[in-house]
Each structure stands twice: as structure tokens, then as C-alpha cells.
């Protein structure tokens, strides 16, 4: 029996019956057998056929077989009821050989030409399969010449059988307190040849309960128990299961915070596998009552295990634990069913005693010492020495605790100083120099440090001088000894106040004229204001209409007197106004350098002479009074003058205020 | 991490003011709780001097009201303790502290030295 | 003023012995605001016990508070050498917060 071509030899070829073209002999028997290479399968199909026709071709015959299955048996030219001829069908080997056997009976009624046929190995596409049979791969199957090879959607990993899919269903860890899980694919069929674990895995303190929810079908056996798929629950005090079938298993409380959960599956079976929905419970905390003027939130039936609670107060009371105050409480519930924070107090804000308003007063209005949320209080400054600044004085203890004003400020009210009060009052003539009387100018300061010197009281805590006055202490402010409220120098009772800082105008220059002769000492405590004890006002803008030539001024201090000494009371002189082009003129002539009078000064005197102001009244204020607030105000500041004081047609000359408001009000803003 | 550092003179003379400065990282002292001042005597003895709120109120220890004042800098995340006219007996070391009123939210600085000597 | 009285000052304990030591209050405390220091020589006291009964963080379990009103206590089961400290009570249930003298607890 011939052999056909063998693989790795080309696969294609002819066979024909003995003697073809011409008649077949008969008592002939010829077999061939074709060999494809692996994952080929061999084609073959008849050009020319005529064999001897009989019952079920029992005398004359070509039959094709494939391993162990017999393809066709072939005679005759066209098919029959019972007998079948090749016509123009295709034939496939069912694997990578096929066998060929002619036969003939040992007679013919007539001769009979055989048979011609062509064969050929092709791939086969082992991924197509028919209707209903098995698919070849789980899921999806790739034909390449000689072969396939099956692949998994992602999530699955291919078995070692090369066909099957399992799933990758293990290392899920579920640590939410309720959740869902269910066999790959739910409610698809589960996939088999699998192994899947879940683990849930809470917190120490919670019990996993399980509830299969939907349907249950795993495949089961009558007899023996789930011997093919199965699900188990395991915990760290017992196991659950197995479990398999179609009945919904009952609801399983671990008592465990860990569950593992292990389904196994075969290769077989077309199942749709289950669902599992946990939840968790533990050990609930004391309810949370909240307290008086608080509530709770969230509000729930029941706080477990990590559950939360906040409390928050109605406006106007605040958190306490104990003496200290909170901003925000919340409090979790532990695993042994404690809170681990103690419930706080909602208290009544209490913004405290109010404080003390320096030369002012506090009253309380809603109650005598109440100083709780909502009451409210009124600060007023002492009457007449004192006036408040910007704000009406009434604070309302609001929900932060803090006392708080109408303008929403927090900070104190501020009494300021009422300025430019004087107990005389002038007539408008000129006087002599005369002596003070008590509350004439109560701003008048002496300054005591190497020479005798004067300044006026600005505010509670500033006093406004010459800057030659106090040059030779600028670095040893400590050194100038300050009285005020006083009218006699030698006086053992006046009001003592020290030197913090000294501040000279940085155009001053000592020893080189008088120009910006201007300087501000900073007290280092507030002095207590009275009659006796007034600061001057500074100059409105409006000021100039009331110091023009000829207006009357009032000079005071204890500068030399017409005696040549030192006055012992306060004296003080009323002069006019000098035209300043003519004091310029009058300080021109030898031995005063040129320009010696600046636009930063004023002159005030009588051209006949006899008053003025002199040595020892330096840095004292030059007043006047404002007409429409009733307030005197420093206009001048005692700078300079003739050699010998009081000279006719010489004046005194004076530091002129009103120029040098804005580096006043720089320096006690900034100190 | 929350911490707390104190800083200040060391040495003080009598009569004079004393000036501390706790500094924190880590939580904002206007977030929550109560910052409080703490001391320790050379015998051990530990007092509560005063605290400033995480709103800026404060209260202090009555025995220490007149002298005491503690205010802050929420720009800095700092508060203060200033203690008036100081003397021997003021002599400590003293801490910035948390007082927990949370789980585990106590926090103490290390401390610093006060001596008042002349 | 609440006073606190820690009893007693010193006291010394073996490796493995019981230990208590009691903080009474002059009136009554919340146990929600009685707390409980560690110090050791050097440092700053540490968060022991808080709300009298609960252990701070890292605290060993051999430690537990307890007490209610005027009277509280703190146990050590089984004294460790490590455990050798001052210990402090705290209340912050009124004004002025109040510590006691503290217990030395030396190790025998």
C-alpha cells in the first residue's frame, strides 16, 4: 500500500485508481495515507469518479477515514437513497491524516473508469466550531497556520489545560463597614477551574454579618456533599459551609471582625454562582444626650464603633470641657463601647469684668455685674478734662466673648484729653506782664535740666518745646526733670513726669540759627488732666484767621523778668502780632546774620517795647484763642529774640506751629 | 507633629518684667483648644498660670491676675506670657502647654529656666 | 480653689509588685477632667490617664485609673522598672486648673 508525501514534504498531490484514465482491474485494493503537519488537516476532492454501483457499495468502493472515523464510503457516479458518490463535495480529515482505500469485487458488469482526486493539507481554524459543541477556548480563541491558542479577558488568567479561563479572584480585601461581594461574573455563569478568596477585614471592635442576597446556584451532586464547586466562610473562631446548590444560605453573624470567603470551581458546569452583602455592628456607646442650649449631630438610632457625634451650641453659649473651651467637639465611639471624649457644656459666653478705661468710668446697664452674652455696658470719660474719641462708649458682650462697641470694635474706647481749656479769658488790650492765676495755662511745663526751660502739654503724654532747649539732653532724655501744674517754680508741689524720648526736627541745627527750632518729648507715663493740668490744642487748619498781624497772643513762663531774675510765679504777657516783613527787616541790621527770620516763624511784640518774653522762657507756647471753639491753641513756640528782651523796635520771635503739624502728628503717631 | 517651644531670658532681677514666647508647628493656635502657661518650682510643684483660647480670650490663675497678661500672634502662630514685677519666688521652669480635652491632643513644650536673682 | 492630694509623696515598689496611689480632691471632680501625668527628671510631664479611667496613647496596660467624686487612683499591676516617675493629677473641672504634689515612685 502506497504511503503518501510525509510532512515536512510539500502536502499536496493527486490520486487516481489503477490504470486511470483507462478501466479499473478487478480484485483490487489500494490504500494511501496522507500525513498534514500538526494543526493542518488535509482537503481532498474528486475530478473524475466512476466505480461500480451496489447496495451500500459493497462490491467496488473508495473509502475515506480519519483516525478511528470513517468519513464517506464512495461508488457509483451520482448519489442515491443508500449509496453516496463524491459529485463535487469537498472532503476534510477530521486531524492531520487521512486514509484512502479503493476496492474492487472480483467482477464488473461493465468496465469502470476509477476515480481522480487532488489533495492538499490546510490550516485548521480550530476556532470554529459547530453548533453546539464545546467552544474551543473559555473566551477568546486565535487561529494562526498549524495551530490556535485561546487568551482571557482581563481579570481571568489562562489555566495549565491551555483552554480554560480562571479567574484572578483573590487578595480582595473589602475594610468598609457594609459592603457587597459576589462570584466573578454574578449573574452570568462563574467561570471554572477557579479559586477565588475574599477577605473582609474590619477594625477590632465590629462583627461582619453576611446576608446572600438575589439567588444561589452553585453546582451541586445529589448524593455527595458539593463535591464539584463550593463556597466556605471562614473566620478566626469557626468555619461556614460548604455551601453549593440553589437554596439562599441564612444569614451568618461572624461574631469576627475578619471573614474569609473561599469559592472553589471545576471544570465543568454552567452556574450562575452568588451574592453576599455584610454589614457590621459592634458594641453601641451610651446614647448621646446633648446638653442644655447644645444639640447633637448627627442625630442616629444607634452609635457603633467609630460612629461620630458633634455638638454644637446656640449663639451665644460656647463648648467647655471643665474650665477650657473648645472651638469645635467631637466625640467617636470606641471599640468598647465607650465615647473617647467626655460631653462637653454649652455655657453662656461670659466676656468677663469689663476692663478699666483709663481717666474714664464703665457702668453696667443690662444688670449689676452682668457680663454675660448679650448684656451690655456704657464707658464714659471723666466730664470736662476728658472727651471720647470716635466711638459712643457702649459694648455689648457678643458670642466670640468679647466686649464689642456699635462699630463692631473690640479694642478699649479711647479718653482723650479735652485741649485748650484756660480759667482766663481775654479782653483783646495789652497787659503788662502780670502773674498767673491758677488754671490760666494749665499747659505751661518747666523743663529743669541743665538751664530753665519751657514747653506746652500736648495730649496726656507729649510735651511740644524748643529744640534748643532740649538739644544738649537729646541722647539723655532721662536727664530733663518736667513739672507741671504748678504755678510757682520753686514750688515742692507739682506734678513730676520723666522723659521716655526726645525727638528735634531734623532741619534744626544747633548753634547756626533758629530755623525749625521744634521739638516733641515723649512722657513716660500719661499725666492725670485737671484744671491745673491741660494740654493746648494744636492748630486747625482755620487757625491762620485767628493769628494775623496785630491779633493778640499770650506768652507765658518763668523766663528772666525786667528785675533780671528769674521769675518765681508764673508770669505771662499779652502781644500782638508783628508784620512779618517787618519783623524781617528789624532782624537784617548788625550784629543778626541775614535771613536770620524764616517763613517757619512768627514775631510778636510792641514796637515800643517793654513786653515780651525771655530767657528761660524758651519752648513755652505762644496762644491764642480760636473764637469758634472757644479753645486756646499754640501758635508759637518761644525760640528767640533780641540780646536784651523787651527792646524797642525788636520782637520776639517764635517757632510758627502751624507749619509743622504733619511732623507733629508723624511723631506721636509712629511713638 | 504638633510642638511646642518656649524661649526666653533665663535670667530676670527682681521687680522687672518677665517675657516669654511659646512657638508652635504643626496646628494653628487659632484652630481649637486653650493655650496654656505652666510652671514648675525647684521643689516640683507644678502650677497653671494661665491660657489664651483658641478665640484670644484668656483666663488666668487669681493668684497671678494682677501680674499676669498672655496674649499672642496669630501671623506667627506664637503666644506670650508676660509676668510683672518678678521675684525670687517666681523662680521655675516654665512650659507652654495643651491640656488634652481630645484623645491624646496634649502636648507640652520642654520647658525653659527662670531664674530671678540680682 | 480645688486642692488636689496626692498620697503618698514617695513611695518604692519591687520589679512585679501592685502599685496604687490616690489624688483626693478637696470637692468634687468631674472624672470626665482628672487627668494623670508621667514625668520623668529632665523632661515634661506626659499625658498618662485622661477622663480619670482611659490610657494615652503607648501607656502599657498595666496601668489603669479609676474614681469618681473627691477620690481617684492609678494602679500599676505589675511594677516595671521603666514605670519609676513622678506622677501628677490634674483637674480642669473649675478655675484655676489645679495639679496635686505628685507621688515619686521609686523602683526597690
Known amino acids: 500500500t502506497p504511503l503518501g508525501p510525509k510532512w515536512p514534504e510539500p502536502v499536496f498531490g493527486r490520486l487516481a485508481s489503477p490504470g486511470f484514465p483507462g478501466e479499473y482491474a478487478n480484485d483490487q485494493e489500494r490504500r494511501w495515507t496522507l500525513t498534514a503537519p500538526p494543526g493542518y488537516r488535509l482537503r481532498l476532492y474528486f475530478t473524475h469518479f466512476d466505480l461500480e454501483l451496489s447496495h451500500l457499495c459493497e462490491y467496488d468502493f473508495v473509502k475515506l477515514s480519519s483516525g478511528a472515523k470513517v468519513l464517506a464510503t464512495l461508488c457509483g457516479q451520482e448519489s442515491t437513497d443508500t449509496e453516496r458518490a463524491p459529485g463535487k463535495d469537498t472532503f476534510y480529515s477530521l486531524g492531520s491524516s487521512l486514509d484512502i482505500t479503493f476496492r474492487s469485487d472480483y467482477s464488473n458488469e461493465k468496465p469502470f473508469t476509477g476515480f481522480e482526486a487532488f489533495y492538499a493539507a490546510e490550516d485548521i481554524d480550530e476556532c470554529q466550531v459547530a453548533p453546539g459543541e464545546a467552544p474551543t477556548c473559555d473566551h477568546h480563541c486565535h487561529n494562526h497556520l498549524g495551530g490556535f491558542y485561546c487568551s482571557c479577558r482581563a481579570g481571568y488568567v489562562l489555566h495549565r489545560n491551555k483552554r480554560t479561563c480562571s479567574a484572578l479572584c483573590s487578595g480582595q480585601v473589602f475594610t468598609q463597614r457594609s459592603g457587597e461581594l459576589s462570584s466573578p461574573e454574578y449573574p452570568r455563569p462563574y467561570p471554572k477551574l477557579s479559586s477565588c478568596t475574599y477577605s473582609i477585614s474590619l477594625e477590632e471592635g465590629f462583627s461582619v454579618i453576611l446576608d446572600f442576597v438575589e439567588s444561589f446556584d452553585v453546582e451541586t451532586h445529589p448524593e455527595t456533599l458539593c463535591p464539584y464547586d463550593f463556597l466556605k466562610i471562614q473566620t478566626d473562631r469557626e468555619e461556614h459551609g460548604p455551601f453549593c446548590g440553589k437554596t439562599l444560605p441564612h444569614r451568618i453573624e461572624t461574631k469576627s471582625n475578619t471573614v474569609t470567603i473561599t469559592f472553589v470551581t471545576d471544570e465543568s458546569g454552567d452556574h450562575t454562582g452568588w451574592k453576599i452583602h455584610y454589614t457590621s455592628t459592634a458594641q453601641p456607646c451610651p446614647y448621646p444626650m446633648a446638653p442644655p442650649n447644645g444639640h447633637v449631630s448627627p442625630v442616629q438610632a444607634k452609635y457603633i464603633l467609630k460612629d461620630s457625634f458633634s455638638i454644637f451650641c446656640e449663639t451665644g453659649y460656647e463648648l467647655l470641657q471643665g474650665h477650657l473651651p473648645l472651638k469645635s467637639f467631637t466625640a467617636v465611639c470606641q471599640k468598647d463601647g465607650s465615647w473617647d471624649r467626655p460631653m462637653p457644656a454649652c455655657s453662656i459666653v461670659d466676656c468677663g469684668p469689663p476692663d478699666d478705661l483709663p481717666s474714664g468710668r464703665v457702668e453696667y446697664i443690662t444688670g449689676p455685674g452682668v457680663t454675660t452674652y448679650k448684656a451690655v455696658i456704657q464707658y464714659s470719660c471723666e466730664e470736662t478734662f476728658y472727651t471720647m474719641k470716635v466711638n459712643d462708649g457702649k459694648y455689648v458682650c457678643e458670642a466670640d466673648g468679647f466686649w464689642t462697641s456699635s462699630k463692631g470694635e473690640k479694642s478699649l474706647p479711647v479718653c482723650e484729653p479735652v485741649c485748650g481749656l484756660s480759667a482766663r479769658t481775654t479782653g483783646g488790650r495789652i497787659y503788662g506782664g502780670q502773674k498767673a492765676k491758677p488754671g490760666d495755662f494749665p499747659w505751661q511745663v518747666l523743663i529743669l535740666g541743665g538751664t530753665t526751660a519751657a514747653g506746652a502739654l500736648l495730649y496726656d503724654n507729649w510735651v511740644l518745646t524748643a529744640a534748643h532747649a532740649v538739644y544738649e539732653q537729646k541722647h539723655d532724655a532721662s536727664a530733663l526733670d518736667i513739672r507741671m501744674g504748678t504755678l510757682k517754680r520753686l514750688s515742692p508741689h507739682y506734678t513730676q513726669a520723666w522723659s521716655e524720648a526726645v525727638f528735634i526736627h531734623e532741619g534744626y541745627t544747633h548753634d547756626a540759627g533758629f530755623d525749625n527750632d521744634i521739638a516733641l518729648i515723649k512722657l513716660n507715663n500719661k499725666v492725670v488732666i485737671n484744671s491745673n493740668i491741660t494740654p493746648i490744642c494744636l492748630p486747625r487748619k482755620e487757625a491762620e484767621s485767628f493769628m494775623r498781624t496785630d491779633d493778640i497772643g499770650t506768652a507765658s513762663g518763668w523766663g528772666l523778668t525786667q528785675r533780671g531774675f528769674l521769675a518765681r510765679n508764673l508770669m505771662y504777657v499779652d502781644i500782638p502780632i508783628v508784620d512779618h516783613q517787618k519783623c524781617t527787616a528789624a532782624y537784617e541790621k548788625p550784629p543778626y546774620p541775614r535771613g536770620s527770620v524764616t517763613a517757619n516763624m512768627l514775631c510778636a511784640g510792641l514796637e515800643s517795647g517793654g513786653k515780651d518774653s525771655c530767657r528761660g522762657d524758651s519752648g513755652g507756647a505762644l496762644v491764642f484763642l480760636d473764637s469758634e471753639t472757644e479753645r486756646w491753641f499754640v501758635g508759637g513756640i518761644v525760640s528767640w529774640g533780641s540780646m536784651n528782651c523787651g527792646e524797642a523796635g525788636q520782637y520776639g520771635v517764635y517757632t510758627k506751629v502751624i507749619n509743622y503739624i504733619p511732623w507733629i502728628e508723624n511723631i506721636i503717631s509712629d511713638f | 507633629d504638633v510642638q511646642l517651644q518656649e524661649s526666653g531670658p533665663g535670667l530676670v532681677r527682681p521687680s522687672q518684667s518677665l517675657s516669654l514666647t511659646c512657638t508652635v508647628t504643626?496646628?494653628?493656635?487659632?484652630?481649637?483648644?486653650?493655650w496654656n502657661w505652666i510652671r514648675q518650682f525647684p521643689g516640683n510643684k507644678l502650677e497653671w498660670m494661665g491660657y489664651?483660647?483658641?478665640?484670644?480670650?484668656?483666663s488666668y490663675n487669681p493668684s497671678l491676675k494682677s501680674r499676669l497678661s498672655v496674649t499672642r500672634d496669630t501671623s506667627k502662630n506664637q503666644f506670650f506670657l508676660q509676668l510683672n514685677s518678678v521675684n525670687a519666688a517666681d523662680t521655675a521652669t516654665y512650659y507652654c502647654?495643651?491640656?488634652?480635652?481630645?484623645?491624646?491632643?496634649?502636648?507640652w513644650g520642654q520647658g525653659t529656666t527662670l531664674t530671678v536673682s540680682s | 480653689q480645688i486642692v488636689l492630694t496626692q498620697s503618698p509623696a514617695i513611695m518604692s515598689a519591687s520589679l512585679g509588685e501592685r502599685v496604687t496611689m490616690t489624688c483626693t480632691a478637696s470637692?468634687?471632680?468631674?472624672?470626665?477632667?482628672l487627668l494623670w501625668y508621667q514625668q520623668k527628671p529632665g523632661s515634661s510631664p506626659k499625658l498618662w490617664i485622661y477622663?480619670?479611667?482611659k490610657l494615652a496613647s503607648g501607656v502599657p496596660v498595666r496601668f489603669s485609673g479609676s474614681g469618681s467624686g473627691t477620690s481617684y487612683s492609678l494602679t500599676i499591676s505589675s511594677m516595671e522598672a521603666e514605670d519609676a516617675a513622678t506622677y501628677y493629677c490634674?483637674?480642669?473641672?473649675?478655675?484655676?486648673?489645679?495639679f496635686g504634689a505628685g507621688t515619686k515612685l521609686e523602683l526597690k
Open positions: 470637692s468634687s471632680v468631674s472624672s470626665s477632667y
Open positions: 490634674l483637674q480642669y473641672n473649675r478655675s484655676p486648673l489645679t
Open positions: 502647654a495643651i491640656i488634652s480635652t481630645a484623645v491624646d491632643f496634649d502636648y
Open positions: 489664651i483660647s483658641y478665640s484670644g480670650r484668656t
Open positions: 504643626g496646628y494653628s493656635i487659632t484652630s481649637d483648644y486653650a
Open positions: 477622663s480619670s479611667s
